[in-house]
């Protein structure tokens, strides 16, 4: 459309704006009980862990962001049984970690979840 | 807990995953006519915003991250009427932009919300 | 480094269109804003409009609704049409970028006269 | 508009001299985000624009440092500490802050 009235510099910061909000991996704090499906007496600490999601805006409203790469990461976290019949242990957990990510249209699409040890 | 069979360097990384995850402004991207409540004959270029929102998490499924103060940023935005009547109108949207959250219980409360102009 | 080239005709006549194209080496549009600027005789320099990457244009209102820039992404140019010319639009015809900092690469210019 | 007016026309120098032109804008072009957006651009014959110096005071790439410029507001000065032969040419202003945007009238810097 025609700019009748706005100069580079302005257009600019909207620019850099526009790019920051794109789909893209974000840093993303992810519940891990809730994640994994574990019954309710089983509690992880820390209760969340950090991962880079898809997160961002499409500029279709028939699109959303979705991952198109995915890499797994370790994270070791205390598993905790309730009542507290033995020590906490150090369990490995790996945690879903976007990579890639890409305006898609909303068709059905199972999302990617954690993989537990 | 007891730790008995964890070594210190082993903690720590937990422990600074941990900090990561806790409640606290995170810089999140924002549909801005959704959040303004727009008629669907209006668009904004760019759609989306960034700001910062309280998120991560509470170590009590009682408590949610909530934010405690709240500033108001101005974003500089096209504004669309469709059909394209008039050039794109550039329009301050002025966006909540939260700058302390907290752990609070999970009583009702009327979320912040973006004040227009 | 960024390269720019005008192409086009060196002869047009008076109320006919004037059409330009810039190609744009060692650049992709998916950044930065793409200007036209003209050097009348008598060293006298004009900012003419420019079009975004996004296709948002501006046109210097002296010129109200005779000129039109457009662009072809998957080419890496971008037009200017200048139209219902006159002997006042015999000029020196520039294409530039303006990236981080304003009017930083310029193409090389073509001379364009209006006469009959 | 913003008229942008430069000081002198024409200028003549020796090699070696000092070379001083001054651009003055009609009202202030310090742009609404606190930069002021005022480039100077030196045309060689039968060359393109070249920039020199962008947002008053900035060398842009390439650009021998005896080259300089300084201002605020209204009034801007491009220096040339000494001048050289490959300097000679045409020395234009621009401001990049108000469309639309607008150059200054050109200095013609010359041998004596």
């Known amino acids: 459309f025609a700019a009748t009235f706005y100069d580079i510099e302005t257009l600019k910061v909207i620019d850099e704006e526009w790019q920051r909000t794109q789909c893209s991996p974000r840093e993303t704090c992810v519940e891990v009980a809730s994640e994994l499906g574990k019954s309710t007496n089983t509690f992880f600490k820390p209760p969340c862990v950090n991962v880079f999601r898809c997160g961002g805006c499409c500029n279709e409203e028939s699109l959303i962001c979705m991952n198109t790469s995915t890499s797994y990461i370790s994270k070791q976290l205390f598993e905790i049984s309730v009542p507290l019949t033995s020590v906490p242990e150090l369990v490995p957990v790996k945690v879903a970690n976007h990579t890639g990510c890409k305006c898609l249209p909303t068709a059905p699409r199972h999302p990617y979840s954690i993989i537990r040890r | 807990f007891a730790a008995t069979f964890y070594d210190i360097e082993t903690l720590k990384v937990i422990d600074e995953e941990w900090q990561r995850t806790q409640c606290s402004p995170r810089e999140t991207c924002v549909e801005v006519a959704s959040e303004l409540g727009k008629s669907t004959n209006t668009f904004f270029k760019p759609p989306c915003v960034n700001v910062f929102r309280c998120g991560g998490c509470c170590n009590e499924e009682s408590l949610i991250c909530m934010n405690t103060s709240t500033s108001y940023i101005s974003k500089q935005l096209f504004e669309i009427s469709v059909p394209l009547t008039s050039v794109p109108e550039l329009v301050p949207v002025k966006v909540a932009n939260h700058t302390g959250c907290k752990c609070l219980p999970t009583a009702p409360r009327h979320p912040y919300s973006i004040i227009r102009r | 480094e960024v390269q720019l080239q005008e192409s086009g005709p060196s002869l047009v006549k008076p109320s006919q269109t004037l059409s330009l194209t810039c190609s744009v080496t060692g650049d992709s549009f998916t950044s930065d804003y793409w200007n036209w600027i003209r050097k009348f005789p008598g060293n006298r320099l004009e900012y003419m409009g420019y079009i975004s990457y996004r296709g948002v244009t501006y046109y210097n209102p002296s010129l109200k609704s005779r000129i039109s820039i457009t662009r072809d992404t998957s080419k890496n140019q971008y037009y200017l049409q200048l139209n219902s010319v006159t002997t006042e639009d015999t000029a020196t015809y520039y294409c530039?970028?303006?990236?981080?900092?304003?009017?930083?690469?310029w193409g090389q210019g073509t001379s364009v006269t209006v006469s009959s | 508009d913003v008229l942008m007016t430069q000081t002198p026309l024409s200028l003549p120098v020796s090699l070696g001299d000092q070379a001083s032109i001054s651009c003055r804008s009609s009202?202030?072009?310090?742009?609404?985000?606190?930069?002021?957006?005022l480039e100077w651009y030196l045309q060689k014959p039968g060359q393109s624009p070249k920039l020199l110096i962008y947002k008053v005071s900035n060398r842009f790439s390439g650009v021998p440092d005896r080259f300089s410029g300084s201002g605020s507001g209204t009034d801007f000065t491009l220096k040339i500490s000494r001048v050289e032969a490959e300097d000679l040419g045409v020395y234009y202003c621009f401001q990049g802050s108000h469309i639309p945007y607008t150059f200054g009238g050109g200095t013609k810097l010359e041998m004596k």
């Open positions: 530039a970028r303006w990236g981080t900092v304003p009017l930083d690469y």
């Open positions: 009202q202030s072009i310090v742009h609404s985000n606190g930069n002021t957006y």
